[in-house]
Interface confidence: medium
Protein backbone atom coordinates (compact mmCIF):
# COMPACT_ATOMS: atom_id res chain seq x y z
CA UNK A 1 0.00 0.00 0.00
CA UNK A 2 1.43 3.15 -1.01
CA UNK A 3 1.12 6.55 0.81
CA UNK A 4 -1.71 7.92 -0.66
CA UNK A 5 -3.76 4.66 -0.26
CA UNK A 6 -2.98 4.72 3.47
CA UNK A 7 -3.37 8.14 3.95
CA UNK A 8 -7.39 7.65 2.50
CA UNK A 9 -7.67 4.58 5.06
CA UNK A 10 -6.31 6.51 8.01
CA UNK A 11 -8.18 10.46 7.13
CA UNK A 12 -11.29 10.01 9.03
CA UNK A 13 -9.11 9.90 11.86
CA UNK A 14 -6.92 12.04 11.92
CA UNK A 15 -8.47 14.96 13.17
CA UNK A 16 -7.12 14.42 16.92
CA UNK A 17 -3.94 13.34 15.68
CA UNK A 18 -1.26 14.14 17.66
CA UNK A 19 1.97 15.85 16.75
CA UNK A 20 4.46 12.76 17.15
CA UNK A 21 1.79 11.37 14.29
CA UNK A 22 1.37 14.40 11.87
CA UNK A 23 5.29 14.39 11.84
CA UNK A 24 5.65 10.38 11.14
CA UNK A 25 3.16 10.75 8.36
CA UNK A 26 5.11 13.79 6.91
CA UNK A 27 7.52 10.62 6.47
CA UNK A 28 5.56 8.54 4.30
CA UNK A 29 4.43 10.35 1.15
CA UNK A 30 0.62 10.57 1.88
CA UNK A 31 -0.06 14.24 0.07
CA UNK A 32 -2.48 15.35 2.79
CA UNK A 33 -5.30 17.76 1.17
CA UNK A 34 -5.79 21.11 2.91
CA UNK A 35 -9.70 19.99 4.02
CA UNK A 36 -8.08 17.77 6.41
CA UNK A 37 -5.24 20.10 7.21
CA UNK A 38 -7.27 22.96 8.22
CA UNK A 39 -9.57 20.35 10.63
CA UNK A 40 -6.38 19.02 12.86
CA UNK A 41 -5.63 20.03 16.26
CA UNK A 42 -4.11 23.34 15.91
CA UNK A 43 -1.72 22.13 19.10
CA UNK A 44 -0.50 19.24 17.28
CA UNK A 45 0.05 21.36 14.16
CA UNK A 46 2.09 24.10 15.94
CA UNK A 47 5.23 22.13 16.18
CA UNK A 48 5.85 20.91 12.63
CA UNK A 49 8.63 22.45 11.17
CA UNK A 50 7.93 24.23 8.04
CA UNK A 51 9.89 21.15 5.66
CA UNK A 52 7.69 18.77 7.52
CA UNK A 53 4.37 20.48 6.24
CA UNK A 54 5.63 20.84 2.86
CA UNK A 55 6.54 16.74 2.74
CA UNK A 56 3.22 16.11 4.36
CA UNK A 57 1.21 18.23 2.39
CA UNK A 58 2.94 17.50 -1.26
CA UNK A 59 1.28 19.13 -3.91
CA UNK A 60 -1.35 20.51 -1.21
CA UNK A 61 1.57 22.93 -0.09
CA UNK A 62 0.63 25.40 -2.93
CA UNK A 63 -2.44 26.27 -1.61
CA UNK A 64 -1.18 27.41 2.01
CA UNK A 65 -1.54 30.87 0.70
CA UNK A 66 -4.93 30.62 0.43
CA UNK A 67 -5.51 30.02 3.82
CA UNK A 68 -2.47 32.01 5.48
CA UNK A 69 -5.22 33.85 7.76
CA UNK A 70 -7.38 30.62 9.33
CA UNK A 71 -6.34 28.50 11.49
CA UNK A 72 -4.55 26.68 11.79
CA UNK A 73 -2.31 27.62 9.37
CA UNK A 74 -2.42 31.32 10.71
CA UNK A 75 -0.97 30.42 14.33
CA UNK A 76 1.46 28.02 12.64
CA UNK A 77 3.11 30.28 10.53
CA UNK A 78 3.11 32.95 13.39
CA UNK A 79 5.69 30.30 15.48
CA UNK A 80 7.93 29.75 11.87
CA UNK A 81 10.98 31.40 11.65
CA UNK A 82 9.97 34.17 8.53
CA UNK A 83 13.36 32.94 6.39
CA UNK A 84 12.01 29.27 6.83
CA UNK A 85 8.54 30.39 5.25
CA UNK A 86 10.30 31.84 2.84
CA UNK A 87 11.92 28.72 1.36
CA UNK A 88 8.19 27.59 0.70
CA UNK A 89 8.08 30.42 -2.16
CA UNK A 90 4.35 30.97 -1.53
CA UNK A 91 4.42 34.64 0.39
CA UNK A 92 3.43 33.56 3.75
CA UNK A 93 3.88 36.37 6.00
CA UNK A 94 3.93 36.65 9.19
CA UNK A 95 6.61 34.79 10.69
CA UNK A 96 9.30 35.43 12.90
CA UNK A 97 11.68 37.94 11.64
CA UNK A 98 15.81 37.35 11.12
CA UNK A 99 17.61 37.22 14.04
CA UNK A 100 14.75 36.91 17.03
CA UNK A 101 14.59 34.54 19.59
CA UNK A 102 12.00 32.61 20.63
CA UNK A 103 11.29 31.82 24.08
CA UNK A 104 9.05 28.62 24.79
CA UNK A 105 7.18 30.59 27.55
CA UNK A 106 3.48 28.14 27.44
CA UNK A 107 1.93 30.51 30.53
CA UNK A 108 2.90 33.56 28.20
CA UNK A 109 1.93 31.98 24.85
CA UNK A 110 -1.36 30.76 26.45
CA UNK A 111 -1.98 34.54 27.59
CA UNK A 112 -1.14 36.03 24.55
CA UNK A 113 -1.70 33.45 21.64
CA UNK A 114 1.57 34.33 20.51
CA UNK A 115 5.06 33.30 21.19
CA UNK A 116 7.73 35.28 22.74
CA UNK A 117 10.42 37.02 20.93
CA UNK A 118 13.24 38.46 21.95
CA UNK A 119 14.79 41.23 19.57
CA UNK A 120 18.15 41.04 18.28
CA UNK B 1 -3.52 40.84 -15.42
CA UNK B 2 -1.34 37.65 -15.17
CA UNK B 3 0.72 36.91 -18.54
CA UNK B 4 2.93 34.66 -19.19
CA UNK B 5 4.93 34.91 -21.98
CA UNK B 6 7.24 32.28 -23.50
CA UNK B 7 9.89 31.91 -26.72
CA UNK B 8 9.91 31.21 -29.72
CA UNK B 9 9.35 28.01 -31.04
CA UNK B 10 12.42 25.40 -31.69
CA UNK B 11 13.94 22.93 -34.24
CA UNK B 12 16.41 20.54 -32.60
CA UNK B 13 17.93 17.33 -33.79
CA UNK B 14 18.16 13.94 -31.58
CA UNK B 15 20.82 13.95 -28.79
CA UNK B 16 20.72 17.96 -28.53
CA UNK B 17 19.27 20.22 -25.61
CA UNK B 18 16.41 22.59 -25.56
CA UNK B 19 15.62 25.40 -23.24
CA UNK B 20 12.22 27.46 -22.93
CA UNK B 21 11.95 29.99 -21.25
CA UNK B 22 8.13 31.74 -19.52
CA UNK B 23 7.97 34.84 -18.75
CA UNK B 24 5.83 35.95 -15.70
CA UNK B 25 4.28 39.23 -15.34
CA UNK B 26 0.39 40.54 -13.61
CA UNK B 27 1.15 38.63 -10.24
CA UNK B 28 3.82 38.12 -7.75
CA UNK B 29 6.58 35.46 -9.47
CA UNK B 30 7.92 34.37 -5.99
CA UNK B 31 4.62 33.48 -4.63
CA UNK B 32 3.38 31.02 -6.64
CA UNK B 33 5.29 28.00 -8.16
CA UNK B 34 6.14 27.30 -12.00
CA UNK B 35 4.96 24.35 -13.42
CA UNK B 36 5.57 22.64 -17.17
CA UNK B 37 3.54 20.92 -19.03
CA UNK B 38 3.74 19.59 -22.28
CA UNK B 39 1.48 18.09 -25.53
CA UNK B 40 2.95 15.99 -27.95
CA UNK B 41 0.67 16.32 -31.37
CA UNK B 42 -2.66 15.08 -31.54
CA UNK B 43 -2.21 14.06 -27.82
CA UNK B 44 -3.13 14.50 -24.04
CA UNK B 45 -0.82 16.75 -21.96
CA UNK B 46 1.36 15.61 -19.64
CA UNK B 47 2.89 17.24 -16.22
CA UNK B 48 6.65 17.26 -16.75
CA UNK B 49 7.67 19.17 -13.25
CA UNK B 50 7.45 22.34 -11.19
CA UNK B 51 9.80 24.70 -9.64
CA UNK B 52 9.46 26.84 -6.20
CA UNK B 53 10.43 30.44 -7.50
CA UNK B 54 11.71 31.40 -4.18
CA UNK B 55 14.37 29.02 -3.44
CA UNK B 56 14.38 26.72 -6.94
CA UNK B 57 13.02 24.11 -5.47
CA UNK B 58 11.60 21.32 -8.09
CA UNK B 59 9.45 18.00 -8.49
CA UNK B 60 10.09 16.50 -11.56
CA UNK B 61 7.72 13.68 -13.51
CA UNK B 62 10.14 10.51 -12.71
CA UNK B 63 9.74 9.77 -16.74
CA UNK B 64 11.61 13.15 -16.81
CA UNK B 65 13.66 13.34 -14.13
CA UNK B 66 16.99 12.86 -15.72
CA UNK B 67 16.78 15.05 -18.73
CA UNK B 68 14.47 18.12 -17.47
CA UNK B 69 15.47 20.65 -15.50
CA UNK B 70 13.60 23.41 -14.29
CA UNK B 71 14.73 26.45 -12.99
CA UNK B 72 13.91 30.04 -12.39
CA UNK B 73 15.57 33.70 -12.42
CA UNK B 74 13.77 35.61 -9.90
CA UNK B 75 15.15 39.10 -10.98
CA UNK B 76 13.68 38.54 -14.44
CA UNK B 77 10.40 36.86 -12.95
CA UNK B 78 11.26 34.51 -15.59
CA UNK B 79 11.28 30.32 -15.74
CA UNK B 80 12.97 28.06 -17.97
CA UNK B 81 12.81 24.23 -18.65
CA UNK B 82 15.38 22.35 -19.84
CA UNK B 83 15.43 19.28 -21.77
CA UNK B 84 18.35 17.16 -22.44
CA UNK B 85 18.90 14.09 -25.06
CA UNK B 86 16.44 14.70 -27.18
CA UNK B 87 14.43 12.58 -29.23
CA UNK B 88 11.74 12.80 -32.12
CA UNK B 89 8.47 11.48 -29.04
CA UNK B 90 9.85 14.96 -27.65
CA UNK B 91 8.56 16.74 -30.15
CA UNK B 92 5.38 18.83 -28.59
CA UNK B 93 4.13 22.24 -27.20
CA UNK B 94 5.49 23.32 -23.87
CA UNK B 95 3.24 24.80 -21.86
CA UNK B 96 4.40 26.86 -18.32
CA UNK B 97 1.51 27.38 -15.99
CA UNK B 98 1.30 28.89 -12.20
CA UNK B 99 -0.14 26.80 -9.69
CA UNK B 100 -3.41 28.02 -7.30
CA UNK B 101 -3.17 31.84 -8.24
CA UNK B 102 -5.93 33.63 -6.45
CA UNK B 103 -6.50 30.59 -4.08
CA UNK B 104 -7.84 28.27 -6.48
CA UNK B 105 -5.94 25.04 -7.37
CA UNK B 106 -5.45 24.14 -10.63
CA UNK B 107 -4.01 25.68 -13.67
CA UNK B 108 -5.76 28.98 -14.47
CA UNK B 109 -3.26 30.75 -16.57
CA UNK B 110 -1.14 29.15 -19.49
CA UNK B 111 1.70 30.07 -21.42
CA UNK B 112 1.21 30.45 -25.31
CA UNK B 113 2.74 27.25 -25.54
CA UNK B 114 6.24 26.62 -27.04
CA UNK B 115 6.42 24.16 -30.16
CA UNK B 116 9.53 22.07 -30.10
CA UNK B 117 10.37 19.95 -32.96
CA UNK B 118 13.30 17.39 -32.59
CA UNK B 119 14.65 15.82 -35.92
CA UNK B 120 17.35 15.17 -38.10
CA UNK C 1 1.08 7.35 -10.43
CA UNK C 2 -2.61 7.87 -10.33
CA UNK C 3 -4.02 6.85 -13.50
CA UNK C 4 -6.79 9.14 -15.08
CA UNK C 5 -8.85 7.51 -17.27
CA UNK C 6 -11.64 9.17 -19.45
CA UNK C 7 -14.52 7.94 -21.11
CA UNK C 8 -15.58 8.05 -23.76
CA UNK C 9 -13.11 9.21 -25.80
CA UNK C 10 -15.28 11.14 -28.43
CA UNK C 11 -19.02 12.60 -28.18
CA UNK C 12 -21.24 14.00 -30.85
CA UNK C 13 -23.93 15.67 -28.94
CA UNK C 14 -27.16 18.20 -30.57
CA UNK C 15 -26.79 21.51 -30.27
CA UNK C 16 -28.46 22.33 -27.26
CA UNK C 17 -28.54 18.49 -25.71
CA UNK C 18 -26.79 17.29 -22.67
CA UNK C 19 -23.41 16.09 -22.70
CA UNK C 20 -21.48 14.29 -20.20
CA UNK C 21 -17.81 13.06 -19.76
CA UNK C 22 -16.64 10.72 -17.00
CA UNK C 23 -13.45 10.61 -15.36
CA UNK C 24 -12.38 7.56 -13.22
CA UNK C 25 -8.78 7.83 -11.13
CA UNK C 26 -6.94 4.60 -10.38
CA UNK C 27 -7.20 5.54 -6.88
CA UNK C 28 -8.99 8.08 -4.16
CA UNK C 29 -8.49 11.59 -4.88
CA UNK C 30 -10.78 13.02 -2.48
CA UNK C 31 -12.50 16.04 -4.95
CA UNK C 32 -8.49 17.46 -5.91
CA UNK C 33 -9.81 17.05 -9.53
CA UNK C 34 -9.61 20.21 -12.35
CA UNK C 35 -11.21 19.99 -15.71
CA UNK C 36 -9.91 21.60 -18.74
CA UNK C 37 -11.27 23.17 -22.15
CA UNK C 38 -8.80 23.02 -25.26
CA UNK C 39 -9.73 24.19 -28.18
CA UNK C 40 -6.99 23.46 -31.56
CA UNK C 41 -4.25 25.89 -31.83
CA UNK C 42 -4.67 27.19 -27.96
CA UNK C 43 -3.67 26.30 -24.64
CA UNK C 44 -5.92 24.67 -22.36
CA UNK C 45 -8.63 26.19 -20.38
CA UNK C 46 -9.16 26.06 -16.69
CA UNK C 47 -12.96 25.40 -16.24
CA UNK C 48 -13.38 23.49 -12.95
CA UNK C 49 -11.62 22.99 -9.82
CA UNK C 50 -11.58 20.69 -6.68
CA UNK C 51 -14.61 18.67 -8.42
CA UNK C 52 -17.52 21.09 -8.70
CA UNK C 53 -16.73 24.65 -8.53
CA UNK C 54 -16.35 26.91 -11.86
CA UNK C 55 -13.63 29.24 -12.25
CA UNK C 56 -15.11 32.89 -12.81
CA UNK C 57 -16.33 33.35 -16.11
CA UNK C 58 -16.71 29.92 -17.16
CA UNK C 59 -20.32 30.03 -18.43
CA UNK C 60 -22.92 27.86 -15.42
CA UNK C 61 -23.77 25.37 -18.52
CA UNK C 62 -20.35 23.65 -17.60
CA UNK C 63 -20.67 21.93 -14.19
CA UNK C 64 -18.49 19.00 -12.07
CA UNK C 65 -19.44 16.22 -10.17
CA UNK C 66 -18.02 13.74 -8.22
CA UNK C 67 -15.49 12.93 -5.41
CA UNK C 68 -13.03 9.62 -4.35
CA UNK C 69 -12.31 8.24 -7.46
CA UNK C 70 -15.97 8.90 -9.62
CA UNK C 71 -16.26 12.03 -11.41
CA UNK C 72 -18.06 13.55 -14.26
CA UNK C 73 -18.02 16.89 -16.34
CA UNK C 74 -21.72 18.17 -17.80
CA UNK C 75 -22.39 20.81 -20.30
CA UNK C 76 -26.18 20.96 -19.53
CA UNK C 77 -26.93 22.41 -22.98
CA UNK C 78 -24.21 22.23 -25.63
CA UNK C 79 -22.86 25.90 -27.89
CA UNK C 80 -21.31 25.40 -30.99
CA UNK C 81 -18.27 27.18 -28.91
CA UNK C 82 -18.01 24.61 -26.97
CA UNK C 83 -16.60 22.37 -29.62
CA UNK C 84 -13.05 21.15 -27.91
CA UNK C 85 -11.71 18.62 -26.00
CA UNK C 86 -12.13 18.44 -22.33
CA UNK C 87 -9.23 17.06 -20.18
CA UNK C 88 -9.60 16.28 -16.10
CA UNK C 89 -6.64 16.78 -13.77
CA UNK C 90 -5.66 15.22 -10.60
CA UNK C 91 -3.76 17.42 -8.40
CA UNK C 92 -3.78 15.14 -4.84
CA UNK C 93 -0.67 13.79 -5.18
CA UNK C 94 2.74 13.92 -7.83
CA UNK C 95 3.22 13.46 -10.73
CA UNK C 96 0.22 15.54 -11.44
CA UNK C 97 -1.65 13.37 -14.01
CA UNK C 98 -4.29 14.07 -16.88
CA UNK C 99 -6.77 11.95 -18.15
CA UNK C 100 -6.52 11.44 -22.24
CA UNK C 101 -8.88 13.34 -23.27
CA UNK C 102 -12.67 13.51 -24.49
CA UNK C 103 -13.56 15.14 -28.07
CA UNK C 104 -16.96 17.23 -27.96
CA UNK C 105 -18.35 17.65 -31.81
CA UNK C 106 -21.39 18.47 -32.68
CA UNK C 107 -24.20 16.11 -33.77
Known amino acids: MNGSEYFVKIQSFLGGAPTEDLKALSQQNVSMDLATFMKLRTDAVLPLTVAEVQKLLGPHVEGLKAEERHRPVRDWILRQRQDDLDTLGLGLQGGIPNGYLVLDLSMQEALSGTPCLLGP | EVQLVQSGAEVKKPGASVKVSCKASGYTFTSYWMHWVRQAPGQGLEWMGN????????NYNEKFKNRVTITVDKSASTAYMELSSLRSEDTAVYYC?????????????WGQGTLVTVSS | DIVMTQSPDSLAVSLGERATINCKAS??????IAWYQQKPGQSPKALIYSASYRYSGVPDRFSGSGSGTDFTLTISSLQAEDVAVYYC?????????FGGGTKVEIK
Open chain 3, 89 to 97: QQYNSYPLT
Open chain 3, 27 to 32: QNVGTN
Open chain 2, 97 to 109: APHYIGSRPGFAY
Open chain 2, 51 to 58: VNPSNGGS
